[in-house]
Amino acid sequence: KSSNEATNITPKHNMKAFLDELKAENIKKFLYNFTQIPHLAGTEQNFQLAKQIQSQWKEFGLDSVELAHYDVLLSYPNKTHPNYISIINEDGNEIFNTSLFEPPPPGYENVSDIVPPFSAFSPQGMPEGDLVYVNYARTEDFFKLERDMKINCSGKIVIARYGKVFRGNKVKNAQLAGAKGVILYSDPADYFAPGVKSYPDGWNLPGGGVQRGNILNLNGAGDPLTPGYPANEYAYRRGIAEAVGLPSIPVHPIGYYDAQKLLEKMGGSAPPDSSWRGSLKVPYNVGPGFTGNFSTQKVKMHIHSTNEVTRIYNVIGTLRGAVEPDRYVILGGHRDSWVFGGIDPQSGAAVVHEIVRSFGTLKKEGWRPRRTILFASWDAEEFGLLGSTEWAEENSRLLQERGVAYINADSSIEGNYTLRVDCTPLMYSLVHNLTKELKSPDEGFEGKSLYESWTKKSPSPEFSGMPRISKLGSGNDFEVFFQRLGIASGRARYTKNWETNKFSGYPLYHSVYETYELVEKFYDPMFKYHLTVAQVRGGMVFELANSIVLPFDCRDYAVVLRKYADKIYSISMKHPQEMKTYSVSFDSLFSAVKNFTEIASKFSERLQDFDKSNPIVLRMMNDQLMFLERAFIDPLGLPDRPFYRHVIYAPSSHNKYAGESFPGIYDALFDIESKVDPSKAWGEVKRQIYVAAFTVQAAAETLSEVA
């Protein structure tokens, strides 16, 4: 359904007018403005930026712009007692110490308040012991170490390379393996692309560069002290011992120069295979401990960071809808950064700023969207998605009744190769249709659509002739909206070529070198990719807020539900004997998926035929579409993860960044052959099939004719 039928406007105020108003030069200017000093969550600088954004959004023409503050648990290094790691000899003397800070980039030597590299929420401690190299510290890496190589990490300090999975999962895995400390480092194999120079001469990570980041395992809880409820002025706070998701062992990140010094002395077992070798000139021995001459030397961590309840500020802007003001389309991205935030988050925040300006321009000319649009500048995302989660907890009753969609707007770029989209299946058709109308910014695709370049460069692995659209996982501010509240969500950014660049994320992620110049010199000098991302994000918001019929297609959910059911059944069928022994049947799930398919198609038929001039029927049909995502929410949540309530999707238990389908069944089946009580384990599989089948069937029934 085209948006040209937008409410009480002249014909020129359509999607085209909105898109034409978006300007690359403005995004560039906003990015520069947002990246001149650090904006660490909980600091005065980030509060000042919040007030600046509030003021500018008001100037742009939003109806209201408010600050929403919360007092949440944050973590900072001790300014007078720095964190570091040393190699000590048998007398306890420190014969090598890791660096205390990153060498500042040119032009930033005199900037104050650059937080040194640290692992946020690490407990204090000074453990010492032998080192064990654990590759990426993934579940499968510890399986390899413990089961195949018979290497015990208990009482050891483990060193893991960043990449592949969320760092919090690495720490959790190390804890479960009995480690007493974790050292995280960036290996050039993952953070140094061949043929590219280090910053400031290119976009690669220099040896002194370090990735900061939180190491929580919150599982969607938000503020660790107030899970489920907003951290407001009358909040009851848990004691630190009962806080959600805090690590129990000291953790610290280092760069590859320092990692070289630790790894070059490693002895013990050789790496099990080539997948455990990085690109440093070291043997990548697993350990435990150092080799021959250095066997009496140990590693010692010195961690003195503190956890502090600190005030954070979200900026919430409102553009009231003309026809359905009680239906909310939300565009949100975070404002807080580890240092300058050249990519994360300010390349996203600059795009949001320009989208707000464009909407404001239309509003000043007399236009309003059909539905209300909420714009959010979230705080403390880097500390565990805290700002967005607390606001959603505070407003959960409104959101679950009125929330149409949430579009996330963190980093606009992580490369300049092609588009990357993760979203609910309800938005597939919206994304396809929109990208077919936008021009590709890619070289060699002049005059071609974004859809065409995207499909060519990032084809769907399952469906030929279509672009890849991924499942939503977590690690960003959509989490509470999608995984907890069941609000249809999506995200879009420009990405790298995953085929040729095997490094994880982008090399300078969360380092001091993530500057304005990094973007302007190396990633997007013309800001054309930023503009394209603004068009995609803004275009999605425009359509969601303005289409007479919501641009959701329930038939696409039917397609993926079948695919996911097939996939989880195939995983289960790796255990045919146990399936028989314990009478495990997927019939109920497959039946529910078929019913969903049938009902979704009938609903789509009615959607094409109903009288759109009847406001009651229109609202009824739109509500069925809006509430479909909500219907996949189980109020009881997933086992041991009460804030992950979506039955079809959840962040992987092994990698927060990745999405898993039918996560309840998947987790019940995971490593089931090693469970001590197979009867109980397969009983849980059966229970999860039951929950999934019931949920899919219940969701299908929400699409049935109402009477």
Partner: antibody, heavy 121, light 110 residues
Framework: EVQLVESGGGLVQPGGSLRLSCAAS????????MSWVRQAPGKGLEWVSA????????YYADSVKGRFTISRDNSKNTLWLQMNSLRAEDTAVYYC??????????????WGQGTLVTVSS | QSVLTQPPSVSAAPGQKVTISCSGS????????VSWYQQLPGTAPKLLIY???KRPSGIPDRFSGSKSGTSATLGITGLQTGDEADYYC???????????FGGGTKLTVL
């Protein structure tokens, strides 16, 4: 009443291309998965390809993957099969079939009359 | 070689009963719904049974379907000469992400 009418068959040389069409009427075309099923002379039915309702996710038999492309135009109620790099073993009557459930293939409740494709030099 | 296995032919006298078997695996018949099609000589196939055992309107109750484990069966009672045709079973295969058919069974009414 539901009607499916195939066209575009004919004689083509090995390595050549052909585009089959299927004009649909009598139902809400966009809501249903559509398939192509073929039958070589004197042989059984062989499913070739399907396209879902909604955005049109595609599925192919291994024997045609990379050579055939299924597509649909919901505004025109038309299904297509673009056949490239044709081989002698692709000779068959090609049927267009509608799914009886919805957006993904379950069973075929309506079939076209078929169009003959002959690949021969 | 078809993914689903059917007998190439069956025969019976008019008025008799006949069954046609269709054997598959856990990834197709074992978990998915089976349908049956009748193809009279020189015509397009016609849906006979869907969802293992349901008949579309217009199909007489002489035709029945059943499924057990990884096999399905089509039953025809009160055979008539007009039933002479090829019969195909079909289903989805969850591993292949594809529709699969049996090789077909030729029914001869003696």
């Amino acid at each position: 009443e539901v009607q499916l009418v195939e066209s575009g068959g004919g004689l083509v040389q090995p390595g050549g291309s052909l585009r089959l069409s299927c004009a649909a009427s009598g139902f809400t075309f966009s809501s249903y998965a559509m398939s192509w099923v073929r039958q070589a002379p004197g042989k059984g039915l062989e499913w070739v390809s399907a396209i879902s309702g909604g955005i049109g996710s595609t599925y192919y038999a291994d024997s045609v993957k990379g050579r055939f492309t299924i597509s649909r135009d919901n505004s025109k109620n038309t299904l297509w099969l673009q056949m490239n790099s044709l081989r002698a073993e692709d000779t068959a009557v090609y049927y267009c079939a509608k799914d009886g459930v919805g957006a993904t293939p379950y069973y075929f409740d309506y079939w076209g009359q078929g169009t003959l494709v002959t690949v021969s030099s | 070689q078809s993914v689903l296995t059917q007998p190439p032919s069956v025969s019976a006298a008019p008025g008799q009963k006949v069954t046609i078997s269709c054997s598959g695996s856990s990834s197709n018949i074992g978990i998915n719904y089976v349908s049956w099609y009748q193809q009279l000589p020189g015509t397009a196939p016609k849906l006979l049974i869907y969802d293992n055992n349901k008949r579309p309107s217009g199909i007489p109750d002489r035709f029945s379907g059943s499924k057990s484990g990884t096999s399905a069966t089509l039953g025809i009672t009160g055979l008539q000469t007009g039933d002479e045709a090829d019969y195909y079973c079909g289903t989805w295969d969850s591993s292949l992400s594809a529709v699969v058919f049996g090789g077909g069974t030729k029914l001869t009414v003696l």
